[in-house]
């Protein structure tokens, strides 16, 4: 029969970060006389966790089960557990010696594993906007979780994406881990209202995954389509020419009217109308006075959208006694109209 047994009944203990870990240890005897100390790790580099007699261990409290007649309780509690506390803890009996105590017997060790929640996933998109039909990359990052097993999924408007690559670091053992994933998304013209979602599932989240989102409105640029039309005569020698700028996003847009290549007027889109898909429409017009001698005016609507190279649409001004009606005349009602006289 052994002189003394040091019993650590728990091979492993799993604790959530922020909680308290109880590390159990009993000894069958006080003899041989000498202290019991707790260490993390084994060998010369082991870390002293608790020594009853000396030292300051603010996170450690003792736990005594006084009801057990046949052994001594040397269990401890460690408060406010973090992933850095993970490791194997040993309850070690020393025998009093001179000048130093001698290690007599160690418990089998208790492996403390810390369950730490992943941080909220952060999704980031490309630095520059891209147009429909282009493929853009989104990244998702989450940190500080343990254990290593984790599941990450990507969604676009609720539909799961398949084109992504995920890494969990580090590859080897660590107190906590990070996940990094990159997803490829093909943009469509309807994506202004779309969302890309990164969803992270981990044992600590109890079936309630964390989500990070990115709005494609921050990523997409939908270039406008232009249409220039000549409206009916409003008054003697007056022609209304409109430039309809349709289906663009974002709103930042500047329009310039050119007459025979010369700048006539520049304006910035202000009172726009929003389409159901999140894109915008805008209309600008020019009131032109024409004389019988001037029917060869080339009017150009030039649009610079979101800092991109300008696109333009031209219209040869048709002047006759009774010009044919083209398009809508609603623009003529707009008080924001501008008049340009041509002699």
């Amino acid at each position: 029969e052994e002189e003394l047994q040091v019993i650590q009944p728990d091979k492993s203990v799993l604790v959530a970060a922020g909680e308290t870990a109880t590390l159990r240890c009993t000894a069958t005897s006080l003899i041989p006389v000498g202290p019991i100390q707790w260490f993390r790790g084994a060998g010369p580099g082991r870390e002293l966790i608790y020594n009853q007699k000396e030292g300051h261990f603010p996170r450690v409290t003792t736990v005594s089960d006084l009801t057990k007649r046949n052994n001594m309780d040397f269990s401890i509690r460690i408060g406010n557990i973090t992933p850095a506390d993970a490791g194997t803890y040993y309850c070690v009996k020393f025998r009093k010696g001179s000048p130093d105590d001698v290690e007599f017997k160690s418990g089998a060790g208790t492996e403390l594993s810390v369950r730490a929640k992943p941080s909220a996933p952060v999704v980031s998109g490309p630095a520059a906007r891209a147009t429909p039909q282009h493929t853009v990359s989104f990244t998702c990052e989450s940190h500080g979780f343990s254990p290593r097993d984790i599941t990450l999924k990507w969604f676009k408007n609720g539909n799961e994406l398949s084109d992504f690559q995920t890494n969990v670091d580090p590859v080897g053992e660590s107190v906590s881990y990070s996940i990094h994933s990159t997803a490829k998304v093909v943009l469509t013209r309807e994506d202004v209202h779309s969302q890309v979602i990164c969803e992270v599932a981990h044992v600590t989240l109890q079936g309630d995954p964390l989500r990070g989102t990115a709005n494609l409105s921050e990523t997409i640029r939908v270039p406008p389509t232009l249409e220039v039309t000549q409206q009916p005569v409003r008054a003697e020698n007056q022609v209304n020419v409109t430039c309809q700028v349709r289906k663009f996003y974002p709103q930042r847009l500047q329009l310039t009217w050119l007459e025979n290549g010369n700048v006539s007027r520049t304006e910035t889109a202000s009172t726009v109308t929003e389409n159901k898909d999140g894109t915008y429409n805008w209309m600008s017009w020019l009131l032109v006075n024409v004389s019988a001698h001037r029917d060869d005016v080339k009017l150009t609507c030039q649009v610079e959208h979101d800092g991109q190279p300008a696109v333009s649409k031209s219209h040869d001004l048709k002047v006759s006694a009774h010009p044919k009606e083209q398009g809508s005349n609603t623009a003529a009602e707009n008080t924001g109209s501008n008049e340009r006289n041509i002699y």
Epitope: E1, E2, E3, L4, T28, S29, L30, I31, P32, V33, G34, P35, I36, Q52, T61, T62, V63, S64, L66, R69, N70, N71, M72, D73, F74, S75, I76, R95, K96
Partner: antibody, heavy 118, light 112 residues
């Protein structure tokens, strides 16, 4: 029923020797730390010696260290205290006591009286 | 050495009343939250008998009118209510991991 029966006490001259024995029964002797505690009318109870369950480790207070030797024979369920160089102040009733955990004294024998006198 | 001071040295209490005995240690006898202080009863002509182990645990077969409390350096044995058969001398004893183990001087309890 646990029983501890001491023997070997008696009258001895100062400087003399005595060997006390304790016969144990009714429990697993080899699992217990065993001790001797003495009681004098003047000094009350005094711990004298302790031996580990396997017999490897022995402990004594300074008052008897070097003069008393504690041993055990687990095969015979017996505990022995060899007392040499006895002094008048060693006069006392000597109790054999068991300690399951090397802590509190669970069971005590009836005691044997040692008188050191010229 | 850890010195145990028991008080009072003697105590006379009426039957059915509470008897309280104090034991003060010169330094803490606690290890890992356990107080290694024990109480024994000794009647004339008999060996001591364990009543309370590790400050507050009642030894098997001991009546529950005996109770122990305290930690670190201050401990109390209470007998409530006192019965005629409780007339005896009571000793405290510390068995911390600092040798030598020591006993208190004893408290003699009598019936008033």
């Amino acid at each position: 029923e646990v029983q501890l029966v001491e023997s070997g006490g008696g009258l001895v001259k100062p400087g003399g020797s005595l060997r006390l024995s304790c016969a144990a029964s009714g429990f697993t002797f080899s699992s217990y730390v065993m001790s001797w505690v003495r009681q004098t009318p003047g000094k009350g109870l005094e711990w004298v010696a302790t031996i580990s369950s396997g017999g490897t480790y022995t402990y004594y207070p300074d008052s008897v260290k070097g003069r008393f030797t504690l041993s055990r024979d687990n095969a015979k369920n017996s505990l022995y205290l060899q007392m040499n160089s006895l002094r008048a102040e060693d006069t006392a009733v000597y109790y054999c006591a068991s300690q399951l955990t090397g802590s509190e004294f669970d069971y005590w024998g009836q005691g044997t009286t040692v008188t050191v006198s010229s | 050495d850890i010195v145990l001071t028991q008080s009072p040295a003697s105590l006379a209490v009426s039957l059915g009343e509470r008897a309280t005995i104090s034991c003060r240690a010169s330094e803490s006898v606690d290890l890992y939250g356990t107080s290694f202080m024990h109480w024994y009863q000794q009647k004339p002509g008999q060996p001591p008998k364990l009543l309370i182990y590790r400050a507050s645990n009642l030894e098997s077969g001991v009546p529950d009118r005996f109770s122990g409390s305290g930690s670190r350096t201050d401990f109390t044995l209470t007998i409530n209510p006192l019965q005629a058969e409780d007339v005896a001398t009571y000793y405290c004893h510390q068995s911390s991991d600092e040798l030598p183990w020591t006993f208190g001087g004893g408290t003699k309890v009598e019936i008033k």
